[in-house]
């Protein structure tokens, strides 16, 4: 491992669209590729009227949007579906989000997903 | 092992439109970008767009912007990329690729564009 | 999203060394380590042989190497084999806000 880069070995896992695409719906996922290819791990939500509905969480194989990122924060200015990665093992447990280009506050808090 | 599997060869007339479809099996469809290149008979390579496919965000290349769309249906792993308004300078092979390292590819699917 | 820059073509004999090059801009080449060599064989899909500037792919030989300096980075081939004749391009890493933009090609003859 490289000095002072967290190994992202397991993920917070969730899909909201679990019997369409036929995988379980919450657990924690093992992180397997390349071994010589960094991990990260992935959440990605809707914000509908200010309620925080996800979609899914999982790993995200080597990415350099992802490198040294503790935190799984989306910088997008009001995306769609808001994504974010990370790295270091279930650091997608929580996750937020900070538009880039707004220098007000940020739109929501950080949150600790409890699926339903 | 990973595979990405393309649709077949396709003949289209000037105009017209044409989808190719990319299948992805030996891995999690969902933890990787996917992205499409393609290459004119003799020319190099040119890479198109990409799609996230757990978000469905997409960027594209310039040149194709307005022309072509890239989606994706993780209940099939399967990408899609449609490109429309097709014209000659189209005729090329076009290639799906895992990842923003472009780690893995696809055969290759030939569209030919001609009257 | 210009091309990257490529010599067409490059030449050695076998054992000998060869490097092409790969010239861009600051915000492609020179932008964090986002370069990628690789090798396509003639009808046949592209291969991925370096990575992040310099990361070997799995499976490739160390006589494959590649580096960067300032815009331009390099692809180094050492002890070259028949089988390393092919065409070699350079190209950006691209998803999320990066895009992606390859090297116009480089046709290697093994003399």
């Known amino acids: 491992a490289i000095l002072g880069r967290s190994e992202t070995q397991e993920c917070i896992f969730y899909n909201a669209n679990w019997e369409r695409d036929r995988t379980n719906r919450t657990g924690v996922e093992s992180c397997y590729g390349d071994k010589d290819k960094r991990r990260h791990c992935f959440a990605t939500w809707k914000n509908i009227s200010g309620s925080i509905e996800i979609v899914k969480q999982g790993c995200w194989l080597d990415d350099i949007n992802c490198y040294d990122r503790t935190d799984c924060i989306e910088k997008k200015d009001s995306p769609e579906v808001y994504f974010c990665c990370c790295e270091g093992s279930m650091c997608n447990e929580r996750f937020s989000y900070f538009p880039e280009m707004e220098v007000t506050q940020p739109t929501s808090n950080p949150v600790t997903p409890k699926p339903p | 092992q990973v595979q990405l599997v393309q649709s077949g060869a396709e003949v289209r007339k000037p105009g017209s439109s044409v989808k190719v479809s990319c299948k992805a099996s030996g891995y999690t469809f969902t933890s990787s970008y996917i992205n499409w290149v393609r290459q004119a008979p003799g020319q190099g390579l040119e890479w198109m767009g990409t799609i996230n496919p757990v978000s469905g965000s997409t960027s594209y290349a310039q040149k194709f912007q307005g022309r072509v769309t890239i989606t994706a249906d993780t209940s099939t792993s399967t990408a899609y990329m449609e490109l429309s308004s097709l014209r000659s300078e189209d005729t090329a092979v076009y290639y799906c690729a895992r990842g923003g390292w472009f780690d893995y590819w696809g055969q290759g699917t030939l569209v030919t564009v001609s009257s | 999203q210009s091309a990257l820059t490529q010599p067409r073509s490059v030449s050695g004999s076998p054992g000998q060394s060869v490097t092409i090059s790969c010239t861009g801009t600051?915000?492609?080449?020179?932008?964090?380590?986002?370069v990628n060599w690789y090798q396509q064989h003639p009808g046949k899909a592209p291969k991925l042989m370096i990575y992040?500037?310099?990361k070997r792919e799995s499976g490739v030989p160390d006589r494959f190497s590649g580096s960067k300096s300032g815009n331009t980075a390099s692809l180094t081939i050492s002890g070259l084999q028949a089988e390393d004749e092919a065409d070699y391009y350079c190209?950006?890493?691209?998803?999320?806000?990066?895009?992606?933009?390859f090297g116009g090609g480089t046709k290697l003859t093994v003399l």
């Open positions: 600051s915000s492609d080449v020179g932008s964090y380590n986002r």
């Open positions: 992040g500037v310099s």
């Open positions: 190209g950006t890493f691209a998803g999320g806000r990066y895009y992606g933009v």
